[in-house]
C-alpha cells in the first residue's frame, strides 16, 4: 500500500490521543535504556510503511502484536485516514487471524514495540536534511512529498 495520500495530521492526532498511551502501557516495566532503535524512516509515508510492517507482520519471536489494543487502533486509524487502505488489508487480516490465537508478551515483542515508538516519533516530527527549504510539512498540512 502507498501511504502517500493519507491524512497525516489526523493519523498523528489519533496516535497522540490513544495509540501512544497504549504503547506506553505495553512497555510499562521496561527500562528505557534496554532497547536501541535500529529501524528508521525518512518521511511520513515511509514511516507508516515501517509502522504497518512492524505492527501487523509476524516476526521471529513475536507473532502476536496484531491483536494488541495499539495495533487495533493503528489499523482503525489507517483504515479511516488512508484512502483504499482497508481493501488492501482483507487478505492480511485473514492471515493474521490464523497466525495466533493468544497474546504473548516476549522480550522480542517489547523490543519491537520500542522500535514502533521510535518510528511514530519520526512520523510525528520528520527530521529531514535541509536543501533550500527547511519545512517538514507541506502547506496543505496533509501530504508530505519532500525528500531532502
Amino acid at each position: 500500500y502507498d501511504f502517500t495520500n493519507c491524512d497525516f495530521e489526523k493519523i498523528k492526532a489519533a496516535y497522540l490521543s490513544t495509540i501512544s498511551k497504549d504503547l506506553i502501557t505495553y512497555m510499562s516495566g521496561t527500562k528505557s535504556t534496554e532497547f536501541n532503535n535500529t529501524v528508521s524512516c525518512s518521511n511520513r509515508p515511509h514511516c507508516l510503511t515501517e509502522i504497518q510492517s512492524l505492527t501487523f507482520n509476524p516476526t521471529a519471536g513475536c507473532a502476536s502484536l496484531a491483536k494488541e489494543m495499539f495495533a487495533m487502533k493503528t489499523k482503525a486509524a489507517l483504515a479511516i485516514w488512508c484512502p483504499g487502505y482497508s481493501e488492501t488489508q482483507i487478505n492480511a487480516t485473514q492471515a493474521m487471524k490464523k497466525a495466533r490465537k493468544s497474546k504473548v508478551t516476549t522480550n522480542k515483542c517489547l523490543e519491537q514495540v520500542s522500535q514502533l515508538q521510535g518510528l511514530w516519533r519520526r512520523f510525528n516530527r520528520p527530521l529531514l536534511k535541509q536543501q533550500g527549504s527547511s519545512d517538514y510539512k507541506d502547506d496543505d498540512d496533509k501530504h508530505h512529498h519532500h525528500h531532502h
Epitope: W120, R122, Y136
Partner: antibody, heavy 119, light 107 residues
Framework: EVQLVQSGAEVKKPGSSVKVSCKAS????????IEWVRQAPGQGLEWIGV????????NYNENFKGRATLTADKSTSTAYMELSSLRSEDTAVYYC????????????WGQGTTVTVSS | SIVMTQTPLSLSVTPGQPASISCKAS??????VTWYLQKPGQSPQLLIY???NHYTGVPDRFSGSGYGTDFTLKISRVEAEDVGVYYC?????????FGQGTKLEIK
C-alpha cells in the same frame, strides 16, 4: 532517571568558537532527538537546531546555518553544539533538551551553559 | 519562519484566581503547539504538548486549547509555585519557534 548534564561556563573572544557538551544518561541515547536552544540575557528562547544521535541527521535554524555544528558521540552518549565566529550577541545560556516519547515536545532539559563573548 | 505572539507579556494574579495566556501563530500550525514554564533561575520545563496533553506530573489546573493559529493556556487557580515565564512553541515547521514569553507574578 533521565539526565542531561552540560559542560561549564565559557568566556570567549569575538571571532573565536565554543563547543558545549551535553552528556545524556538514563535512556537509550540513540533513540531520541537532541535539541539545542539558547536564551540571551533577559530574553526569550531561540531554537538553534536538532540532531538525531542515531544517524547524525541534523536540521538547523537558518539564523545559525554555517556557524552552528551539531554532533553526537554514541559511545559516550554525548551531544555537542559548536558555534563559530562568535560575536557579542551570542552571549547567552545554551540549553540542550531531549524530545519526549511522542516526538512533539522537549521533556528533559540540561541545566544550561553560560557562554559570554567579550573582548 | 512562523512567528508566535504571546499576550499579555506579563500578568499579576492573586493566588486562587484564574489566569489565561494567549498565543497566536502567524500561520496555521495545526495542533503542533507546546507550552513550557521557566521558573526563576531554572531551565524550562514541559507543561502541555500537542495543544492540550498534560505532561507527566503537571497539575490539572493547567489546560491548553486551540487549533490553527489561536491557542490558550489557562490556569484555573494560580498557586505561588506557578510564578515564572510561560512560553508557547510551535513544532509544525522548521525552524521551531517560541513565543516571546509571558511573565506570571503573584499579587
Amino acid at each position: 532517571e533521565v539526565q542531561l548534564v552540560q559542560s561549564g561556563a565559557e568566556v570567549k573572544k569575538p571571532g573565536s568558537s565554543v563547543k558545549v557538551s551535553c552528556k545524556a544518561s538514563g535512556y537509550a541515547f540513540s533513540n531520541y532527538l537532541i535539541e539545542w536552544v539558547r536564551q540571551a540575557p533577559g530574553q526569550g528562547l531561540e531554537w538553534i537546531g536538532v540532531i538525531d544521535p542515531g544517524n547524525g541527521d541534523t536540521n538547523y535554524n537558518e539564523n545559525f546555518k554555517g556557524r552552528a555544528t551539531l554532533t553526537a558521540d554514541k559511545s559516550t552518549s554525548t551531544a555537542y553544539m559548536e558555534l563559530s565566529s562568535l560575536r557579542s550577541e551570542d552571549t547567552a545560556v545554551y540549553y540542550c533538551a531531549r524530545e519526549d516519547n511522542t516526538g512533539t515536545a522537549f521533556d528533559y532539559w540540561g541545566q544550561g551553559t553560560t557562554v559570554t563573548v567579550s573582548s | 519562519s512562523i512567528v508566535m505572539t504571546q499576550t499579555p507579556l506579563s500578568l499579576s494574579v492573586t493566588p486562587g484566581q484564574p489566569a489565561s495566556i494567549s498565543c497566536k501563530a502567524s500561520q496555521s500550525v495545526s495542533s503542533d503547539v507546546t507550552w513550557y514554564l521557566q521558573k526563576p533561575g531554572q531551565s524550562p520545563q514541559l507543561l502541555i504538548y500537542y495543544v492540550s496533553n498534560h505532561y507527566t506530573g503537571v497539575p490539572d489546573r493547567f489546560s491548553g486549547s486551540g487549533y490553527g493559529t489561536d491557542f490558550t493556556l489557562k490556569i484555573s487557580r494560580v498557586e505561588a509555585e506557578d510564578v515564572g515565564v510561560y512560553y508557547c512553541q510551535q513544532h509544525h515547521r522548521f525552524p521551531l519557534t517560541f513565543g516571546q514569553g509571558t511573565k506570571l507574578e503573584i499579587k
